[in-house]
């Protein structure tokens, strides 16, 4: 029995396994919600602080089935997308389409992914082969990075990859702390 | 330093049940799985089940259902396992071992040192 | 599910040969997701080799892993003594996740 008959009414990305690309900025899927997230008191003149967490911005959850080939995951997965830009904490909206969208006239604020987190998938394959284990990152938070004049779009792709990048002198979270050889690999998976 | 300490030997009569620890330290407790591993006596390692802390999320091996119960409590960083109905083929060492969080691969990097349980009359 | 065969399940060898174990699985397995442990007498194992071919932190260079499909297997350039042990393959590319039965290494 094919995939064809499985109805999906969610947000359907489907990456290679291990690889995530960056979500569009919009989403339209009756699942989506709204938070503002990190907020803050804001500040008087807004960019007269380099504190990021003054600023705040939009989580919105999606649902989406992974596939792996012919195969489809059990049930869908719930993950954030980070979107859009950030505004002080007060002038977010708290839901969609309330209130205006407050956008900048200085350097940018881009919605970024902070944190991630693993979850695994139980891939259901037709042909009665056996369901497989499979991992996948979602995001678990998002945060506002500030990006002057000089940062471009390219930059702004790595953010997600950046974020998930272990920093001397603090652990990141998620990580892993195994292995040599590919030891790169695993300690940089997030 | 990753840590995961277990409680300690368990001596249980038949048909009772028996609930051991494992308490983890030196990482985020809730960014990765937690599996469970049982070894008998001189024998080979069974894939128990494993647990997200995130999100409480359990799977288990189709043997041990109904035998085996994993809960995690986040506020301590402990994971449990209740095994129930106890007879002396569970008799084993029984281990916790962190998964590591990269995507590409399942593997186990940290092992508790083991919870040795004895069923007896 | 998927069975994993060892072997040999025993085997011996002196400081500084070159041995060579093997894993067989009963249907192909993704080769990211086969592990080697470690397991030494009265103690737990360790995550040895990872992906079928990454050692893990602090395993010596002399251990390599190779493998694809049903047939992976676990190498030691030049065994030394620290190297007996039991161990064991894993898949955890199907559910359940399963091991192998080990092979066990005796150094003469």
């Known amino acids: 029995q094919g995939w064809q008959a499985f109805k999906n009414d969610a947000t359907e990305i489907i990456p290679e396994l291990g690889e995530y690309p960056e979500p569009p900025p919009e989403l339209e899927n009756n699942k989506t919600m709204n938070r503002a997230e990190n907020g803050g008191r804001p500040p008087h003149h807004p960019f007269e602080t380099k504190d990021v967490s003054e600023y705040s911005c939009r989580e919105l959850h999606f649902t989406r089935y992974v596939t792996d080939g012919p195969c489809r995951s059990a049930k869908p997965v719930t993950e954030l997308v980070c979107s859009g830009q950030c505004g002080p904490a007060r002038l977010l909206p708290n839901a969609i389409g309330r209130g205006k969208w407050w956008r900048p006239s200085g350097p940018d604020f881009r919605c970024i992914p902070d944190r991630y987190r693993a979850q695994r998938v139980q891939l259901l394959c037709p042909g009665g082969e056996a369901p497989r284990a499979r991992k996948v990152r979602l995001v678990a938070s998002c945060k506002c990075k500030r990006l002057t004049r000089f940062h471009n779009q390219s930059e702004l792709k790595d953010f997600g990859t950046e974020a998930a990048r272990p920093q001397k002198g603090r652990k990141p979270r998620p990580r892993a702390r195994s292995a040599k050889a590919n030891q790169a690999e695993l300690e940089n998976a997030y | 330093e990753v840590q995961l300490q277990q409680s300690g030997p368990e001596l249980v009569k038949p048909g009772a049940s028996v609930k051991m620890s494992c308490k983890a330290s030196g990482y985020t407790f809730t960014d990765y799985y937690m599996n469970w591993v049982k070894q008998s006596h001189g024998e080979s390692l069974e894939w128990i089940g494993d647990i997200n802390p995130y999100n409480d999320d359990t799977t288990y091996n189709h043997k041990f259902k109904g035998k085996a119960t994993l809960t995690v409590d986040k506020s301590s960083n402990t994971a449990y396992m209740q095994l129930n109905s106890l007879t002396s083929e569970d008799s084993a060492v029984y281990y916790c071992?962190?998964?590591?969080?990269?995507?590409?691969?399942?593997?186990?990097?940290?092992w508790g040192q083991g919870t040795s349980v004895t069923v007896s009359s | 599910q998927i069975v994993l065969t060892q072997s040999p399940a025993i085997m011996s060898a002196s400081p500084g040969e070159k041995v060579t174990m093997t894993c067989r699985a009963s249907?192909?397995?993704?080769?990211?997701?086969l592990n080697w442990y470690q397991q030494k007498p009265g103690s737990s194992p360790k995550l040895w080799i990872y992906?079928?071919?990454n050692l893990a932190s602090g395993v010596p260079a002399r251990f390599s892993g190779s493998g694809s499909g049903t047939s992976y297997s676990l190498t030691i350039s030049s065994v030394e003594a620290e190297d007996a042990a039991t161990y064991y393959c894993q898949q955890y590319d199907f559910f359940p996740s399963t091991f192998g039965g080990g092979t066990k290494l005796e150094i003469k």
């Open positions: 249907s192909s397995v993704t080769s990211s997701y």
């Open positions: 992906s079928t071919s």
């Open positions: 071992a962190r998964e590591t969080a990269v995507i590409t691969t399942n593997a186990m990097d940290y």
